[in-house]
């Protein structure tokens, strides 16, 4: 999906009002400097691409983020403020339902959410280029 035509300010507002708090709740108990920041993004569409990938694509050691509160709110924000996003996600959602697993917060998931916090932080930068 190409995130170029999203309403970035509306997505930013959704992040600031709710998603950020849900990310913080998920990370509760984690040490501030426990994880290195290794994932980056250069502009807002790129940030959303990385955010979508880390939030919704299962990775080795962390298959369970998509059902977390922050993930569901992220999905809703992208569906509302990115034209055509919902349609591209129908097949992915059906595939995800088939392999849904019990929710387990692993250290790998915490590391992944730490990276997500960094990506959202970059997405919110006021001077970050659209393209």
């Amino acid at each position: 999906y190409d995130f170029t035509n999203c309403d970035f300010e509306k997505i930013k507002a959704a992040y600031l009002s709710t998603i950020s708090k849900d990310l913080i709740t998920y990370m509760s108990g984690t040490k501030s400097t426990e994880f290195n920041n290794t994932v980056s993004c250069s502009n807002r569409p790129h940030c959303l691409t990385e955010i979508q990938s880390l939030t919704f694509n299962p990775t080795a050691g962390c298959a369970s983020l998509a059902k977390e509160m922050f993930a569901m709110k992220t999905k809703a924000a992208l569906a509302i403020w990115c034209p055509g996003y919902s349609e591209t996600q129908i097949n992915a959602t059906q595939a995800m339902k088939k392999r849904r697993k019990r929710k387990v917060t692993t250290n790998k998931c915490l590391e992944q959410v730490s990276q997500l916090q960094g990506l959202w932080r970059r997405f919110n930068r006021p001077l970050l280029k659209q393209q």
Partner: antibody, heavy 118, light 107 residues
Framework: QVQLVQSGAEVKKPGASVKVSCKAS????????MHWVRQAPGQGLEWMGE????????DYNQNFRGRATMTVDMSTSTVYMELSSLRSEDTAVYYC???????????WGQGTLVTVSS | DIQLTQSPSFLSASVGDRVTITCKAS??????VAWYQQKPGKAPKLLIY???MRHTGVPSRFSGSGSGTEFTLTISSLQPEDFATYFC?????????FGQGTKLEIK
């Protein structure tokens, strides 16, 4: 182990500028954010802003926008905080402090006293 | 910005006493609150993060609790080295803010 070593005390006249340094060691310099916090004599702590050493992006407390400038020297793993148009109310101890993506401060510099006096 | 109000501002107590310091936030900060101890001429030291988690090396007599808008720091049995100033801080939302401090003095 993580160490943040700050420059020495400064005395400045009103209207002047001061540049405080914070040299970091014991960790991957670009992996974490560096913040500046100040404390006026006998007062509380005030967050001034932060810099991301990986790309020098800064975010400031609105109270300091336009007067504070944070920069980074990658070659020496040093962060700088410059405060311009100094006034007597800027007399304070200035601390650098380190965080990851969660913004509480588990590592602090020793502090730099800046005195603004005519 | 989120305001943090600490109470009391000053507290006199004796060695062995149990003391409680309160920090109230002007809006919900989940559990994103830290507590620091500061002694004269020194940088603040992290005691508690995530409202209730003790930082490495912090004695078990220090404990934190609370969520939402009300938080407390408790020292179960004061030791001579605990007389200092204590600050709370919220990191739930930008800009990061501190309470005004509580100075704990020997009675």
């Amino acid at each position: 182990q993580v160490q943040l070593v700050q420059s020495g005390a400064e005395v400045k006249k009103p209207g002047a500028s001061v540049k405080v340094s914070c040299k970091a060691s014991g960790y991957t310099f670009t992996s974490y954010l560096m913040h500046w916090v100040r404390q006026a004599p006998g007062q509380g702590l005030e967050w001034m802003g932060e810099i991301d050493p990986s790309d020098s992006y800064t975010d400031y407390n609105q109270n300091f926008r336009g007067r504070a400038t944070m920069t980074v020297d990658m070659s020496t793993s040093t962060v700088y905080m410059e405060l311009s148009s100094l006034r007597s109310e800027d007399t304070a101890v200035y601390y650098c402090a380190l965080t990851g993506t969660i913004n509480y401060f588990d590592y602090w510099g020793q502090g730099t006293l800046v005195t603004v006096s005519s | 910005d989120i305001q943090l109000t600490q109470s009391p501002s000053f507290l006199s107590a004796s060695v062995g006493d149990r003391v409680t310091i309160t920090c109230k936030a002007s809006q919900d900060v989940v559990t994103a609150v830290a507590w620091y101890q500061q002694k004269p001429g020194k940088a603040p030291k992290l005691l508690i993060y995530w409202a209730s988690m003790r930082h490495t090396g912090v004695p078990s007599r220090f404990s934190g609790s609370g969520s939402g808008t009300e938080f407390t720091l408790t020292i179960s049995s004061l030791q001579p080295e605990d007389f200092a100033t204590y600050f709370c801080q919220q990191y739930s939302s930008f800009t990061f803010t501190f309470g005004q401090g509580t100075k704990l003095e020997i009675k």
